[in-house]
């Protein structure tokens, strides 16, 4: 608020007020008499720049007049009273308010004194993010989108991630004039590393106490990746048995595990148990190489593996040992 | 209703003194500010000044400064201008007028200068 | 100070006729106008404040209008009993300054 004058009555109110999109508004405008000042009102006007004519006056014989009656009420002005307090309520914001609107009173003996005050009009935008299902494209792809629909002005939206990517980010008009929607792709290229990672989109506009922060999780669609545990290149003869593990991330999850080998068919020792395949003891040496094939519904991948089971004496800490 | 009820007309010998009242009914007498216009014959309106029955507070046209005083009796509800050292261009129809812009106005009195 | 310019100090009009009278302000005084009417031998009577607004009881067919330095009064559908001067007024600021008149004159 601008300071007030010294010796003479200055009027006070805020250089800019906001108001939303079809709600009311109060314009706020006092008149402030120095103490020892005396000052008589006989008029409060509002006048828009740009526009000829008064929108609203209050007069001390004739009360109040409007332009747009239903839309303005003088919210303390009353006849019989001193003249103070020229604030003025619009009702039904529409975006052709927005703009610079002058406050004047008629006083004796100073003279007219006036303020102008800028009305903004905005609208709150709502705000919406969602993942970008994406498959293994090896280019650039929209994994997330996050969109501010119906603000004014339009919304200033950022991406927070520790992966990297790209925004792009484009304005439509909304569905109410005046108003933008604001659409904004967080793009990266796709990999298996990225699958339900968290990337944040963050919304700031003049309308929010604070930005809005929304988290989007990321899916990639990708084959399995096979890989084969268990085995320490450690087994020997007569030892008890052992299980190796077929590990496979995959989105979506696995559908099947198929274990086999390099000539065929498992062997009688081994015995497929879903992703788990059991080695049971053997009494001759083995030199096997292993094949666990996973499917899910974007394919099927798989791992190899070559098991030795070697003669020797087994040790303490060997990877198959007796009962 | 509101009224104002100005005193008859005057001649005047140049370099003499007149003082004009208005008095108001139908209003709270310190409600409305009140002004004095002339207006010489056949000629344009000229603000002399106005004032406030409230406090007293006065505002002269610079032109007027000197020539007019303007007073009030709240008691009587009564406005007052005193025109002085008057010469044949003092001669005119004064009005006073109440209210910003000027809504009620009185019937005018007809102040004649002369020898 | 503010100087009130009416440039036509005579118009001419017939009954049921629409006229103007214009009047320009030195400088901007916003809609700090009025207009008044005199009819001859009578006290100005006041029908327009802030440049466009009626006081209550002045015929519909007066129409005020304009803001910053330029102010028109109309009337349309003019009467007999319109024969009158015609005098704007601004009063944004000391002193108040009135024009210099326009007298309506009727056919």
């Known amino acids: 608020w601008p300071p007030p004058g010294t010796g003479d009555v200055v009027v006070q109110a805020p250089t800019q007020v906001p108001g939303f999109l079809g709600d009311s508004v109060t314009l706020p405008c006092y008149l402030q008499v120095p103490n020892m000042e005396v000052t008589h009102v006989s008029q409060l006007t509002w006048a828009r720049h740009g526009e000829s004519g008064s929108m609203a006056v209050f007069h001390q014989t004739q009360g109040p007049s409007y332009s747009e009656s239903k839309r303005l009420e003088f919210v303390a002005a009353r006849l019989g009273a001193e003249l103070r307090n020229a604030s003025l309520r619009m009702f039904g914001l529409r975006v052709e308010d927005e703009g610079n609107y002058t406050c004047l009173f008629v006083t004796f003996p100073q003279g007219s004194r006036s303020v102008d005050i800028w009305l903004r009009v905005l609208a709150k935008p709502q705000n919406t993010a969602e993942v970008q299902k994406v498959q293994l494209t090896g280019e650039p792809v929209p994994m997330a989108r996050c969109v501010s629909t119906g603000g004014r002005p339009p919304a200033q939206i950022t991406w927070h991630s520790d992966l990297g990517g790209m925004p792009n980010t484009s304005q439509v008009p909304g569905f109410l004039s005046g108003t933008v929607t604001v659409t904004s792709l967080w793009i990266l290229v796709p990999s298996s590393q990225v699958d339900g990672k968290n990337v944040t989109c963050k919304v700031e506009h003049e309308s929010f106490e604070k930005p809005q922060l929304l988290t989007v999780n990321l899916t990639v669609y990708y084959p399995p990746e096979v890989s084969i545990s268990g085995y320490d290149n450690n087994w020997y003869l007569g030892q008890n048995e052992a299980t190796l593990t077929c590990d496979a991330r995959s989105n979506p999850e696995p559908t099947g595990y198929n274990w086999s080998t390099t000539m065929g068919p498992l062997p009688p020792f081994a015995v497929a148990q879903g992703a788990q395949l059991l080695i049971r003891p053997v009494d001759k040496p083995i030199n096997t190489t292993l094949i666990c094939n996973v499917t899910n519904a974007l394919g099927a991948r798989q791992a190899e593996l070559t098991v030795q089971v070697k003669e020797g004496p087994p040790s303490e800490h060997s990877g198959i040992s007796r009962n | 209703e509101v009224q104002l009820q100005q005193s008859g007309p005057e001649l005047v010998k140049p370099g003499a003194s007149v003082k004009i009242s208005c008095k108001t009914s139908?209003?709270?007498?310190?409600?409305?500010?009140m002004h004095w216009v002339k207006q010489s014959h056949g000629e344009s309106l000229e603000w002399i000044g106005g004032i406030d029955p409230n406090n007293g507070g006065t505002n002269y046209n610079q032109n007027f400064k000197g020539k007019a005083t303007l007073t009030v009796d709240k008691s009587s509800s009564t406005a007052y201008m005193e025109l002085r050292s008057l010469t044949s261009e003092d001669s005119a129809v004064y009005y006073c007028?109440?209210?910003?812009?000027?809504?009620?106005w009185g019937q005018g009195t007809s102040v004649t200068v002369s020898s | 100070d503010i100087v009130m310019t009416q440039s036509q100090k005579f118009m001419s009009t017939s009954v049921g006729d629409r006229v103007s009278v214009t009047c320009k302000a030195s400088?901007?005084?916003?809609?700090?106008v009025a207009w008044y009417q005199q009819k001859p031998g009578q006290s100005p009577k006041a029908l327009i404040y802030?440049?466009?607004y009626r006081y209550r009881g002045v015929p519909d067919r007066f129409t005020g209008s304009g803001s910053g330095t330029d102010f028109t009064l109309t009337i349309s559908n003019v009467q007999s009993e319109d024969l009158a001067d015609y005098f704007c007024q601004q009063y944004n600021s000391y002193p108040l300054a009135f024009g210099s008149g326009t007298k309506l004159e009727i056919k």
């Open positions: 007028a109440g209210v910003i812009p000027l809504e009620y």
């Open positions: 139908g209003y709270t007498f310190t409600e409305y500010t």
């Open positions: 802030s440049a466009s």
């Open positions: 400088q901007n005084v916003y809609t700090n």
